[in-house]
């Protein structure tokens, strides 16, 4: 399903292959090359086509080359010159260069700010119905529930933290043990990956950057079902994670600490508290029975309350019912006892929007949602093309050198474990891991970040969400310490065991090669991410849900045939790539099963079909609607108005043929500019801060 | 203040019915529960029943049952209580008290009392 | 019924005399138990509720104590305006029910 390869800085022409790379699968980046092509900023790069093969004078003058998508671009300064400029054109550079800043860090605030209100539309629209997953009973005995009950909970509460503490109090009033609590937090860490999945679905509009930031975002969710298939069943044979953490839990003499310090929320929260806040207790009360939650509401109307414990005198219907026998009297015509009530007195009003409307939480969830949705986009095409303007020429040298560049030898390994750190402490940083990879989404889409070098900072991101979840642990009132704490330790050393999986040994590395395969696949048929989502973030945990309430022996019916199948493909796929003589000729490839079995062709035509009606209504709409149309229609030519995702028409009639990514014009504006974002003129006047 | 004001004494012959008043005043009538208590010449007090002016829940104890009859009128704060089948050892000073609903406190404010006396 | 036993049923001291005057119940009924006086001509007045705590504007002379069974109203200094008939009522379970009282007097 790779993508043809294609000459290093060919023109893209349909018509003209390069003989021989039909079977080759894109290569590793070549550090060096990519290093080369940056510093020489000043070479003219030569646009030659793919000449017939007798054509032997071209193809000695400029090396046949294969151009991988995976390469990082070439983000060439098309400004002037600092040192051509005078100073009034300095001073407005410098101010503009300012401007950019304030800009950028004004719409990454607003990226996150989306984000916290997302998680709370979220919560709005399934908090309930997560609560509820959580009081099925046959969590206890059933890991493969418990998991797939910690995907969706978290996935429709947005939060893992949400979700893990809801564990951790029902851990702590002995709803759930602690051993049927660690599938719910195996499953709560790869619900946490939805959300930079989504973030980097509003990237859709260019496709080789679209390619790099879904393979980014989706190398998390790759990194956490690959340990969760591993790590799992070992748990379950040999409950290792339990053991351990009770071992460490019961050799310390915790005493309580203080709150995990709150460092991004103190800035975001003054103005997402204006939009919407939430009473997350309703949530633990539904997933601990608590009939009277399930009438509440999440959105908190009252922020100031009173709370009085007092004394109440109620009726019983005789004197054998009091609730102590020396507080129980009668007035002669009723009997009387004591009951010890905490009544609360609302004082003051919450400030937030919707505080006086009184809609039921799905219709504040529902418009939360679209809007979130709408500035997070919009946020991040105004973040990508800000940091598209800034990060050029020498800048982009030296930042992509600073992030991607190893240390020197003999001390290279040491790069990537560097990288979980800083990946871990600046997830501390932010309190959540979510904000954190979805900030990194679109750095590794316009190509500033490489996937090599986003998986240690988002393993290192899964690691830093757990510390904070310790801090946390740290500082929870004395009965619910022991539980909370080995609940963190749980999910600290589930991520450390995923990262001796599947990061130490660069073989061991497949969370990188399938998300590649997958950015691949999405940026051929962009359907296919929206698909990929649905799929493993909603229809095989819900499945997995159904067949579990059904019972074992329908869970092992239907599990066992579909394992063994998977098994039996992936043997087969192993087989015909490695060795294919073993295998009889029909198997040596796919050919033998039918077109819509094997390749996405078919499926892309009924999406088209499908999706037809959208590609009409879908012209002269906002840049926003575009993006989501496009990203459903895989529609080139129906955006022409607003051209936020038209692609090199050649490109779409030459299916197998890869779409021409920016890089391979002169510069970003250039590429820009042939998609008809940025007027001509602009590039004139962009300068560069070195 | 609070004022519990009872009605006038009554003569009354045996096999007859009497009605005695309490009329209050200086507290809400709804919140308080009317106790009536009978004092026998030289003896000790007996309850007679309870009303609750705001639901006209009544209680009666089991020997006044059938025969006495507990009533409130909530627009005059007044409470009432008709004993029938008078006979002569129900000569007695009858009280009236209140008694705050819900509350442990017992009869904290009392009527004067109206005395009864049955005779042929 | 819950019978209430006072005793003694009368009582003759000095003023400034400290004065004990018991109530036994019949059976349990907790703290459930109220004080009265009643002085010659006039209606009961509460001094005491839930076997000790005192009613509004009553002495701090008076006091009550006990619980359970046994329970006893203390004049610690018997003043001349004391002189009364002092009635013990239980209303742990209905019927409420009196003592048959204690009537004090000074020699």
């Known amino acids: 399903m790779a993508p043809w390869p294609e000459l290093g800085d060919a023109q893209p022409n349909p018509d003209k292959y390069l003989e021989g790379a039909a079977g080759q699968q894109p290569t590793a980046p070549d550090k060096s090359k990519e290093t080369n092509k940056t510093d020489n900023t000043e070479a003219p790069v030569t646009k030659i086509e793919l000449l017939p093969s007798y054509s032997t004078a071209t193809l000695i003058d400029e090396p046949t080359e294969v151009d991988d998508p995976w390469n990082l671009p070439t983000l060439q300064d098309s400004g002037i010159k600092w040192s051509e400029r005078d100073t009034k054109g300095k001073i407005l550079c410098f101010f503009q260069g300012i401007g950019r800043l304030i800009l950028l860090l004004g719409f990454l605030y607003f990226f996150v700010c989306s984000l916290d209100i997302l998680s709370s539309a979220f919560q709005l629209v399934g908090g309930k119905m997560a609560g509820q997953f959580f009081s099925n009973s046959s969590i206890m005995s059933n890991p493969l529930l418990g998991l797939v009950i910690g995907v969706l909970v978290t996935v429709l509460v947005q939060s893992s933290s949400t979700s893990t503490s809801i564990v951790v109090s029902m851990v702590s009033s002995s709803l759930l043990t602690v051993r049927a609590a660690i599938p719910i937090i195996m499953g709560a860490n790869i619900g946490t990956s939805i959300t930079n999945t989504i973030v980097a679905l509003m990237q859709v509009g260019d496709r080789s950057e679209f390619r790099r930031a879904f393979a980014g975002a989706t190398v998390h969710d790759f990194f956490n079902w690959l340990s969760v298939l591993v790590l799992l069943p070992v748990e379950v044979a040999t409950h290792y994670l339990e053991i351990i953490t009770q071992l460490i839990v019961e050799s310390f003499h915790f005493k309580n600490g203080e709150d995990a310090p709150d460092l991004l929320k103190v800035i975001t929260k003054p103005f997402t508290k204006l939009i919407v806040q939430l009473d997350k207790k309703v949530i633990s009360q539904i997933a601990m029975n608590d009939e009277k939650a399930k009438n509440k509401s999440l959105v908190k109307i009252w922020c100031k309350t009173f709370t009085n414990k007092t004394q109440i005198n109620v009726t019983v219907p005789s004197t054998a019912n009091c609730t102590s026998p020396s507080l129980c009297w009668t007035d002669g015509i009723q009997n009387w006892t004591m009951k010890n009530v905490t009544y609360k007195e609302n004082i003051a009003k919450c400030q937030h929007i919707f505080v006086n409307f009184h809609l039921p939480d799905l219709a504040v969830g529902t418009i939360l949602l679209i809007l979130s949705l709408l500035v997070l986009c919009g946020c991040l095409i105004m973040i990508v093309k800000i940091l598209g303007s800034v990060l050029k020429g020498q800048v982009a040298t030296v930042i992509k050198k600073t992030i991607n560049t190893d240390f020197p030898f003999p001390f290279a390994w040491l790069t990537g474990y560097l990288a979980i750190l800083v990946g871990a402490g600046m997830t501390f940083i932010v309190q959540s891991s979510s904000v954190f990879t979805s900030a990194l989404t679109p750095l590794i889409g316009i190509g500033v970040i490489t996937i090599e070098r986003a998986y240690p900072l988002t393993l290192g991101s899964n690691i830093g969400t757990t510390t904070t979840a310790i801090l946390a642990a740290l500082a929870s009132p004395g009965n619910a310490l022991r539980s909370s704490l080995q609940i963190a330790l749980c999910h600290f050393f589930f991520n450390i065991s995923g990262i001796l999986l599947w990061y130490p040994i660069p073989f061991t590395r497949l969370p990188i090669r399938m998300a590649k395969g997958l950015g691949n696949i999405s940026a051929k048929y962009r359907w296919f991410a929206v698909f990929y989502l649905i799929i493993f973030f909603f229809l095989i945990p819900l499945t997995v849900f159904g067949l579990s309430l059904a019972g074992w022996r329908v869970l092992v019916g239907v599990g066992v045939p579909v394992v063994f199948i998977i098994i039996l493909v992936l043997c087969l796929r192993l087989l015909q790539s490695r060795c294919p003589r073993v295998l009889p000729k029909k198997l040596q490839n796919w050919n033998f099963l039918p077109l819509w079995m094997r390749s996405l062709k078919p499926w892309d035509a009924v999406v088209s079909k499908f999706t037809g009606c959208f590609q009409m209504r879908c012209c002269c709409c906002c840049r926003v609607c575009c993006r989501a149309c496009c990203l459903l229609c895989d529609c080139p030519k129906c955006c022409r108005c607003s051209k936020c995702c038209e692609d090199l028409e050649e490109a779409q009639e030459g299916q197998d043929v890869p779409v021409k990514a920016p890089e391979t014009f002169d510069n970003i504006t250039i590429s820009r500019e042939a998609q008809g974002e940025v007027p001509a003129s602009d590039s004139k006047t962009e300068c560069t801060a070195l | 203040q609070v004022q519990l004001v009872q009605s006038g004494a009554e003569v009354v012959k045996p096999g007859s019915s009497v009605k005695v008043s309490c009329k209050t005043s200086?507290?809400?009538?709804?919140?308080?529960?009317i106790h009536w208590v009978r004092q026998s010449p030289g003896q000790g007090l007996e309850w007679i029943g309870g009303i609750i002016p705001n639901n006209d829940v009544t209680n009666y104890k089991q020997n006044f049952r059938g025969r006495a009859t507990l009533t409130a009128d909530k627009s005059t704060s007044t409470a009432y209580m008709e004993l029938s089948s008078l006979r002569s050892e129900d000569t007695a000073v009858y009280y009236c008290a209140r008694w705050r609903n819900a509350y442990y406190s017992a009869m904290d404010s009392w009527g004067q009392g109206t005395t009864v006396t049955v005779s042929s | 019924d819950i019978q209430m036993t006072q005793s003694p049923s009368s009582l003759s001291t000095s003023v400034g005399d400290r004065v004990t005057i018991t109530c036994t119940a019949s059976?349990?009924?907790?703290?459930?138990v109220a004080w009265y006086q009643q002085k010659p001509g006039k209606s009961p007045k509460l001094l005491i509720y839930?076997?000790?705590t005192r009613h509004t504007g009553v002495p701090e002379r008076f006091s009550g104590s006990g619980s359970g069974t046994d329970f006893t109203l203390t004049i610690s200094s018997l003043q001349p305006e004391d002189v009364a008939t002092y009635f013990c009522q239980q209303y742990r379970t209905s019927p409420l029910t009196f003592g048959g009282g204690t009537k004090v007097e000074i020699k």
């Open positions: 839930w076997a000790s």
């Open positions: 059976q349990d009924v907790g703290t459930a």
């Open positions: 200086g507290f809400f009538f709804t919140e308080y529960i």
